[in-house]
Structures are given as C-alpha cells and as structure tokens.
C-alpha cells in the first residue's frame, strides 16, 4: 500500500476518506488506528457501528469520529481540532474476524495556523509537501 | 441459478504442468471470492486459498503457497488454480466454491460449490 | 493458523436418533463456524453458518451452537439422507481451516 498524505491545519478539523470496493468489503465493519512505530502494531482508536447496517451512523472516541458510506464504499475519519501530537501514520482498516485488511495507509501532517500571530517570528509558509515512496498529499 | 461448473478430469504426469478452471454463471462473479479446496482420496477438506476476482486479491494457506497458483480473469467470469511442477501427492478433487454474502454479512462461509475436478498424477 | 478438531471421528446411528457432532477450536473465533455436509462423489453443502443460523433450504432438524472455541451440530431425529460426511470450518481468519471430518454412519 502506498502512503496518502492528508494536511490539515491546527485548531481545525480534518477529514481522511478512503475509498474501497463496496462489494469486496460488503458487510464488514471499519476502523480507524494509529501506526505504533514503522513496524509496530497498530492501535485502534474508533471504529464504526457494531451492527454494519448502521455503519451510517457516526461514531466518536474524544476528538475522532468514523462514518461509512457501505454503498458507495467511501470511509470518512474526521480529527477535529487537530493538535500537533495528532501528527503520524494511521491506517483505515476492514474488518473481518480477527483479520484487520488494509484500506489505506495515511500520514497525518499538522500545519501551524497561518493566522496565529503568537510566533510570527517562526512563521512557516507551508509549500509542497515533502515526498516519499509514491506519496499522495490531499488538504 | 447460480453455477459453478469446473473443468473435467485431468490425468498427469509427475513434473507436468497443469491449469484448471472454475467459471461461474448466474450472479456478478467479479463481486465474490472463490476459494479452492483439496480433498485427497478418502480424506477431509483443505482450504488452499481464495480470490477476489475484481482485483485479483489472493490470500493463501500457508500450506499451500508457493506449490500453487490462483488466479482469475473476471471478464469470462473464471477463477483458475494452476501447478508449475505437479507431485504424486497433488493427486485429488478440487473444488471451487464461492464465498457466501448475504445482505448483512461479509462471512468465510461458502454457499455455492462446483462439482470437482479429479487430478490424477501418475507415472 | 487455527486448527479444527472434530469428534468423534465417526458415529453409527439409527434413523430417529438424535446425534451431536462437537468442533473444538484451537483458539477462540467468536461464532465464525459453519457446518457442510458431504456425501460421497459430491461436493460440500452448507449447512449452517455463524454458528447457529440455518442456510436456506436446509431441515429445521439440523442446529448448531456455541461460541468461542467449542461448539456443536446437532441433527434431532436422522433422516436416511443425513448418513454423510459433516465438517465444521472456521471464518474468523486465513487459512479457513475445515475440521477432519465426521463420518455419520448407518447403525
């Protein structure tokens, strides 16, 4: 799996969609986890309703929220008042079981608010994303 | 209806290679996984692996992988299991079966089987 | 892997009889089981999926339960085109294992 790069600025929501094929995974749940480490685990941080037909509905743990669109195969993560530490790599999951299948790797990036005046000294005009391995940045 | 019919009988020499095949009929073959399973003469079943045939995502026994291949090509709606270098021991029925998906549940169930193809190798 | 132990391995039994037929799992796989019946030149026939939800068109003669790692088919009064060969297999995860096999034969 290649690597997305959503930006968002601090202090204001993000959204992550990532899409999938609706009948590949018809009928299983998502998640949402956050990549410990380049080789470690990755640990769940909100998934969508315990019963798929309701997978509609959105789902929140503390400033992260999940919504799946089953039928048109598109899962949204919205990280509201996006923090620094919210900075990383996640993942968008299936799930099946004890199987987890990967939908899309993401990196996270936090940009500083560029109306923030506090430490205009420091101001960083955010330009291109810097690349990696076949990256593919979305605001 | 839906149907799976596999190809015929097939009998080998050890070392030949060999390519069999499942094509599915009555039902959108792109949007379901076919599993192939083993069943050696007078044994039980053994699940060797599965295809998605709309990406062609497979997933492999462990017990199985690297000795076989499956494959697919969704637009004759035919999912194929295939050996490089057959064995005496690959002598059996295989089966394809399609993976169940009922209107709420993704499951590893398997609704829909073909009626087996027999390989027989054998010097 | 997880692995699927049937037993018994064979059971004799009469027409009326009510037979259980047990699967043990090596590791717990919630209620992800199905049961297949097979007879002899015949591919497999499902049976029952997610533990206990009978698939269409099967007799409601035929059950399953359990969850985690043991569970159990149960057939309540034998029918003379239920002596097959019946099979539990996991879905919790790759490989989908099948247990070995019950045979159910005429007593």
């Known amino acids: 799996h290649n690597t997305t790069v959503f930006q968002g600025v601090e202090g204001q929501s993000l959204q992550v969609s990532c899409p999938y094929d609706s009948m590949k995974h018809w009928g299983r749940r998502k998640a949402w986890c956050r990549q410990l480490g380049e080789k470690g685990p990755c640990q769940r941080v909100v998934s969508t309703h315990n019963l798929w037909l309701l997978s509609f509905l959105r789902r929140r743990n503390g400033s992260t929220a999940i919504t799946d669109d089953t039928l048109g195969g598109t899962l949204t993560i919205t990280l509201r008042n996006l923090q620094p530490h919210d900075a990383g790599f996640y993942q968008c999951q299936s799930l099946h079981g004890s199987e987890a299948d990967t939908l899309r790797k993401v990196l996270v990036e936090v940009l500083a608010d560029p109306l923030d005046h506090r430490d205009a000294g420091d101001l960083w005009v955010p330009g291109e994303s810097e690349s990696f391995e076949d990256a593919h940045v979305e605001h | 209806e839906v149907q799976l019919v596999q190809s015929g009988a097939e009998v080998k020499k050890p070392g030949e290679s060999l390519k069999i095949s499942c094509k599915g009929s009555?039902?959108?073959?792109?949007?379901?996984?076919i599993a192939w399973v083993r069943q050696m003469p007078g044994k039980g079943l053994e699940w060797m692996g599965i295809?998605?045939?709309?990406?062609?995502?497979?997933r492999y026994s462990p017990s199985f992988q690297g000795q076989v291949t499956i494959s697919a090509d969704k637009s004759i709606s035919t999912a194929y299991l295939q050996w490089s270098s057959l064995k005496a021991s690959d002598t059996a029925v295989y089966f394809c079966?399609?993976?169940?998906?009922?209107?709420?549940?993704?499951?590893?169930?398997?609704?829909?089987w073909g009626q087996g193809t027999l390989v027989t190798v054998s010097s | 892997d997880i692995q699927m132990t049937q037993s018994p391995s064979s059971v004799s039994a009469s027409v009326g009889d009510r037979v259980t037929i047990t699967c043990r799992a090596s590791?717990?796989?919630?209620?992800?089981l199905a049961w297949y019946q097979q007879k002899p030149g015949k591919a497999p026939k499902l049976l029952i999926y997610?533990?206990?939800s009978l698939q269409v068109g099967v007799p409601l003669r035929f059950s399953g339960s359990g969850s985690g790692t043991d569970f159990t088919l149960t057939i309540s009064s034998l029918q003379p085109e239920d002596f097959a060969t019946y099979y539990c297999?996991?879905?919790?995860?790759?490989?989908?294992?099948f247990g070995q096999g019950t045979k159910l034969e005429i007593k």
């Open positions: 079966a399609r993976q169940r998906t009922f209107y709420y549940d993704s499951s590893g169930y398997f609704d829909y």
């Open positions: 009555g039902h959108s073959f792109t949007n379901y996984w």
């Open positions: 295809i998605y045939p709309g990406d062609s995502d497979t």
């Open positions: 590791q717990g796989i919630s209620n992800w």
């Open positions: 997610a533990a206990s």
């Open positions: 297999q996991q879905a919790d995860s790759f490989p989908r294992n």
